[in-house]
Amino acid sequence: AGVFELQIHSFGPGPGPGAPRSPCSARGPCRLFFRVCLKPGLSEEAAESPCALGAALSARGPVYTEQPEAPAPDLPLPNGLLQVPFRDAWPGTFSLIIETWREELGDQIGGPAWSLLARVTRRRRLAAGGPWARDIQRAGAWELRFSYRARCELLAVGTACTRLCRPRSAPSRCGPGLRPCAPLEDECEAPPVCRAGCSLEHGFCEQPGECRCLEGWTGPLCTVPASTSSCLGLRGPSSATTGCLVPGPGPCDGNPCANGGSCSETPGSFECTCPRGFYGLRCEVSGVTCADGPCFNGGLCVGGADPDSAYICHCPPGFQGSNCEKRVDRCSLQPCRNGGLCLDLGHALRCRCRAGFAGPRCEHNLDDCAGRACANGGTCVEGGGAHRCSCALGFGGRDCRERADPCAARPCAHGGRCYAHFSGLVCACAPGYMGSRCEFPVHPDGVSALPAAPPGLRPGDPQRYL
């Protein structure tokens, strides 16, 4: 269990000459809302799919009124964090969708107006418990600056918030390698911060900075197994009768990462993510400055030369981690389109395209529109190996060379008037008829046999659907 937190820092016109001065239209004052949606995984999901990890809504922002001559100020934003609680494990990879909505407050014909001003989608990797991640995104003419993080709550700890913390009243009645079964008792509470490196599985502390071992474990950080077990000799041979779980031995058991490093399992081994100032396989090397060259893979080290000052590694593209020690798996974002194979060459990404596709990301369909022109302002649409022209109003045919009048076939029934419209045709129905083609009579009692389409409008009011 835990909570995803999003802090909006600013929302306003992006750089460039076409940027709007104000989020409000000319119709009067407005205010902003932010809506956040979280979806698991990194896949490009449909915008309509539910926010499976959760969603949240900001408070309403203060009213914003544009001053015609004044320079555009920072927009007043809703106060506080947007918080999205999650019940299960934090997935680590997720899609973040942030929508900026405008509510217009002036009296208007047709009622209050709402608009979706901007929608940004980011696919991200993020470990729970890490620092705030900052981001700047542009959506159309707008720029959004924000920070986000995931943190564990209640008794959960770890990068996925899946490990349960100890009750402060430990030690447990479970023996070596055994931990209390979930759910933990109500009297459990989050423990104080123990000594750096104290085993999360086998140690606990009553006071900050100490590391006391559970029965069956010993050593300064409670990582050394002892020989006795309080889970043996109890009723029945099964550990299930004792309320103890027997976890399989894992490479991160006992937390091999020193100095507060966090351990994550890799196939057959483990990997330590070290806090700033430490490095090495087990984060065992400390007192490091830039003079020691702690930044790997061409990372640039910034920091003081004296032993007390921390350093920061600025990593080159393709590498991450506090010491630039980890290669970014850039192919996991699936940048190659149309089934292309992604190759991470270190200095660059390369897409090996399937037959019929080309381009840096296999985005071009070779067979479709190459060398084919659509006449009279038509645009070529790629797809399925055969080109198709989307013709401008008034033209038709395979290449948009034929004149077309959408009203020529008299599509509006029962005397309805046909209007050529930028997206097709619309029918204005005669009194007593409704439907997209005026095909349904309105019965005297007001009941009509309509399909699931909206009813026709009055004469002279063209419909806005097709």
């Epitope: 809302f33 809506r35 969603a55 047709g110 709402w114 979706l116």
Partner: nanobody
């Protein structure tokens, strides 16, 4: 695609009450706005009440303020219109409508709503 099914219409005496229901199915996540509209014979369709589904904001036509209440049950994907103190001039075919938004959506403008139900008749006699 979103499908909307209305129910709850009928005949009632002036001063009576009715509760209309609109059940939505399909891509309901994209329906940020749901509302009730009505069309009396020989008149244009007009907005009655609309709900911004994710923020519980409402808008009402002046003619129904204080008498009609729009609400929703998110778990059931259903929107309701509670109509009290009905008048003969409330007689009309009542339609449920839904809209997503990428540009302006005026909450009581039928032209801004893309998805429609088939309607349910409400008749108020004096």
């Amino acid at each position: 695609q979103v499908r909307l099914v209305e129910s709850g219409g009928g005949s009632v005496q002036a001063g009576g009450s009715l509760r209309l229901s609109c059940a939505a199915s399909g891509s309901t996540y994209s329906t940020n706005f749901m509302g009730w509209f009505r069309q009396a014979p020989g008149k244009e369709r007009e907005g009655v009440a609309t709900l911004v589904t994710w923020v519980e904001r409402t808008a009402y036509a002046d003619s129904v303020k204080g008498r009609f209440t729009i609400s929703q049950d998110r778990a059931k994907n259903t929107v309701y219109l509670q109509m009290n103190s009905l008048k003969p001039e409330d007689t009309a075919m009542y339609y449920c409508a839904a809209a997503a938004a990428s540009t302006d959506v005026r909450l009581l403008d039928p032209g801004d709503f893309a998805y429609w139900g088939q309607g349910t008749q409400v008749t108020v006699s004096s």
